[in-house]
């Protein structure tokens, strides 16, 4: 039902001039590699008789740190790659004024997305090439020249999979009030086909259209305390990788087979979205597998039917949707959508009609939180590793990072005067903010005790008088005698201690004759050892969950559930009088030697774990020679 | 898998001192705020102390007398209590966030990892 290309154009809208608001000054000079785009960002638009001010941010969220970009390159070969430190220019916000609003725009050229202010949902996109200040249009979804689209779903698909549809299953909830459980991650795959490909023309344009999309839908979704994180994008630049066929079932079908081939050697996602620029036959615009979210048939097919993105971001939500479990509104007697215009309707509607929706109903959550108790949903529990995220460093997350001098938390929630909470820069007259030496924002004396022994196998630290942070942990040197073993980078590892981690307080080592054999794969004893460093081998206590064991005669050990692998005896268990386990065999303490380091320390100190002199308090490393005063007296004293 | 794994729950007389661990798999755990929360008979679930990497915030009812640290090379969070008092009778949570995540440190449903929780119990 895709409206004729090129796109169709808005039937009555109305031209603003965005004004973008002063940012505050903030007291430090970031990196320049930070990017173009501000991490927040408010701009003032005229419309339908009212100023809006709109208060967004960068939606740092929006692609995970592996996240990976797939193409055809000129030569005809497959290309993978993984965009490095790329800015980025999708924002997430607020109407100021308005308690319930949202906005999801992108600001790369011009102002273009949506914004809700009560039952209004709002367009804006630029008018011409005058940037964010430029002409720009806002008007309402009705306003934009298109035929209702459907969902492809069926109620006879939906039956069995969903159960009884009755009244009595929702419990409405206050339309603005989140679930109150953890945030749920869904990590998202988007192949984009070669139709939608020649539609937009390029790669880049490509790129900025699904980013567009899924920050719309993630917004969509964070109503529910979801958020979707981009991890892969596909682009068919080249050619089809499965037949894209207008029937959307088909498609469906070869989208799921195609993808169950590939996940080897492409991301693991918890779910694909193809979005495609081929005509699906009839009204249909999507088309998902019920309840398959976290499964091998994870997945939904798009048809990008409208000029706007938000339009294709509203149908892969609602195909999302029933991934996780969501039925159309319209099949559940009793179902409540709070939207409050006449036409209004939520999501899982079962047709968008002329308007975009922007909320899900009171049974789409209640399906949702009802999914959310199958074992399957598991893997939307774990968040992206967000470690390399698009966007730089966050002042208020009380890690100390890139360009700060300290971070100790959101604004509402600092107490600490050494800080300041918005800059994250040192206030007036403050050496330091945190670590065990920083004391009333000044460096603590040297010598003072900072972190004291734990343990037989550990030593003491003590503050180096120029240091907010308390030196690096440092053990005793390896080799060191400890109850039953010797001591190794910290830890002291016996046979007997290794075998109650694994099997609880009853776990014992085993006799010294299991250790006599290594085990091959299948539980076989094999050839004979002559020492106790192979495979860990205990008796008695309580069989650790989730392992299977081998058992021969009275010796147990701990395998993989395929049985090719076996729990070792770690590095640095005694094994003998004078000796340890060391690569795997059994030798004697003075391989954890290369010479007699302590004598190196002046009598001022002790050799570490890393054979390095751990100074006594108040001595000066490297060799404990000089006292910590004098050189720093040298070297001219604080930080 | 994710797994948060609390221990050190143990019995105490008032005026006693309890060391708790969590121990993280599973996670890349240098990228998360890492927070002890405790739920006390007929209470709600409270945040008690947060860190992140190297600051650390502690709410009133823990500031003075608990500690909380991490070790990123262990995946270890822990929690120092001292001069325990009968009130301080609970299951103790760890839970962990996204370092990316924003708001106030007192929003449970921004911690997307939690434990089954360890009782400590404070007797007179």
């Known amino acids: 039902i895709a409206p004729s290309r090129p796109w169709a154009l808005m039937e009555q809208y109305e031209v603003v001039l965005p004004w973008r608001l002063p940012g505050p000054r903030v007291r430090r000079a970031l990196p320049s590699h930070l990017g173009l785009h501000p991490e927040r960002v408010s701009y003032v638009l005229g419309a339908t008789g009212h100023n809006f001010t709109l208060h967004l941010r960068k939606n740092r969220d929006l692609l995970g740190s592996g996240y990976t970009e797939t193409y055809t390159a000129a030569n005809g070969s497959e290309v993978t790659e993984q965009p490095r430190g790329q800015d980025h220019c999708f924002y997430q916000g607020h109407v100021e004024g308005y308690p319930d609003s949202a906005a999801s725009l992108s600001t790369c050229a011009g102002l273009r997305g949506f914004f809700q202010v009560g039952s209004d949902l709002h367009l804006i996109e630029p008018l011409d090439e005058g940037g964010e200040g430029g002409r720009h249009a806002v008007y309402q979804a009705e306003h934009l020249l298109q035929t209702a689209g459907t969902c492809g779903v069926s109620d006879d698909s939906l039956g069995s999979l969903l159960g009884p549809r009755t009244a009595a299953v929702f419990r409405p909830r206050p339309g603005d009030s989140l679930p109150s459980r953890e945030t749920r991650y869904v990590e998202l795959y988007v192949v984009v086909d070669n139709a939608e490909f020649q539609m937009l023309g390029s790669e880049a344009a490509v790129r900025h259209r699904v980013l567009e999309v899924v920050n719309h839908v993630d917004k969509l979704y964070q109503k529910l305390n979801f958020r979707v994180v981009l991890v892969g994008l596909e682009i068919w630049n080249s050619q089809d990788r499965f037949h894209v066929s207008p029937d959307p079932s088909v498609t469906l079908e070869n989208l799921l087979t195609w993808q169950a081939r590939q996940r080897t050697r492409r991301h693991l996602h918890d779910n694909v979205q193809l979005i495609t620029g081929v005509d699906f036959t009839g009204t249909t615009v999507g088309f998902a597998r019920v309840s398959a979210m976290c499964s091998h048939s994870s997945g939904a097919v798009n048809q990008d039917h409208s000029k706007n993105p938000v339009g294709v971001a509203c149908t892969m939500a609602h195909e999302m949707g029933h991934n996780l479990g969501m039925d159309h509104d319209e099949n559940v007697q009793g179902c409540r959508c709070q939207e409050r215009f006449e036409a209004g309707r939520c999501i899982m509607a079962g047709s968008i009609g002329s308007s975009f929706p922007r909320m899900f109903s009171d049974c789409s959550q209640a399906y949702l939180e009802s999914f959310l108790e199958r074992p399957q949903s598991v893997c939307l529990a774990n968040a992206p590793d967000l470690s390399h995220l698009v966007g730089g460093p966050v002042c208020g997350n009380l890690f100390v990072e890139r360009g700060e001098q300290c971070d100790c938390g959101p604004p509402e929630d600092c107490r600490n005067r050494c800080c300041n909470s918005t800059t994250c820069q040192l206030a007036e007259g403050a050496q330091c903010a945190h670590g065990t030496c920083c004391q009333e924002c000044k460096v603590k004396p040297a010598g003072e005790l900072c972190r004291p022994k734990k343990d037989m196998c550990d030593l003491e630290e003590f503050c180096d008088g120029r240091h907010p942070e308390c030196p690096e942990d440092a053990f005793q040197e390896n080799g060191t005698p400890c109850s039953g073993g010797y001591c190794y980078n910290g830890a002291c590892p016996t046979l007997a201690q290794q075998c109650q981690a694994f099997w609880g307080p009853g776990g014992q080592a085993a006799e010294e004759s299991c250790f006599s054999y290594d085990i091959l794969p299948g539980c076989k004893a094999s050839r004979y050892r002559a020492d106790m460093c192979g495979v860990l081998q205990c008796k008695g206590g309580q069989q650790p969950l989730g392992r299977a064991i081998c058992i021969v005669d009275v010796c147990h050990a701990l395998t993989t559930e395929d049985g090719t692998a076996y729990e070792p005896v770690p590095e640095g268990t005694r094994c003998g009088p004078e000796k340890v386990c060391w690569k795997g065999r059994c030798q004697d303490l003075h391989v954890y030697r290369s010479s007699n380091c302590s004598a190196q320390c002046h009598n001022h100190g002790v050799c570490n774990h890393k054979q390095e002199c751990h100074c006594h308090a108040g001595w000066a490393p490297p060799h404990c020679a000089k006292l910590l005063t004098e050189v720093h007296a040298a070297s001219g004293s604080l930080p | 898998e994710v797994q948060l794994v609390e221990s050190g729950g143990e019995s105490v007389q008032v005026g006693g001192s309890v060391r708790l661990s969590c121990a993280a798999s599973?996670?890349?755990?240098?990228?998360?705020?890492m927070g002890w929360f405790r739920r006390a008979p007929g209470k709600e679930r409270e945040l008690l102390a947060a860190?992140?990497?190297?600051?650390?915030h502690y709410a009133d009812s823990a500031t003075g007398r608990f500690t909380i640290s991490r070790d990123n090379a262990k995946n270890m969070v822990y929690l120092q209590m001292n001069s325990l008092k009968t009130e301080d009778t609970a299951v103790y949570y760890c839970?962990?966030?996204?370092?990316?995540?924003?708001?106030?440190?007192?929003?449970?449903?921004?911690?997307?990892?939690w434990g089954q929780g360890t009782q400590v119990t404070v007797s007179s």
């Open positions: 860190i992140g990497d190297p600051s650390t």
């Open positions: 839970a962990a966030r996204s370092r990316y995540s924003t708001g106030t440190l007192y929003d449970q449903t921004k911690y997307i990892y």
């Open positions: 599973g996670l890349t755990f240098s990228n998360f705020i």
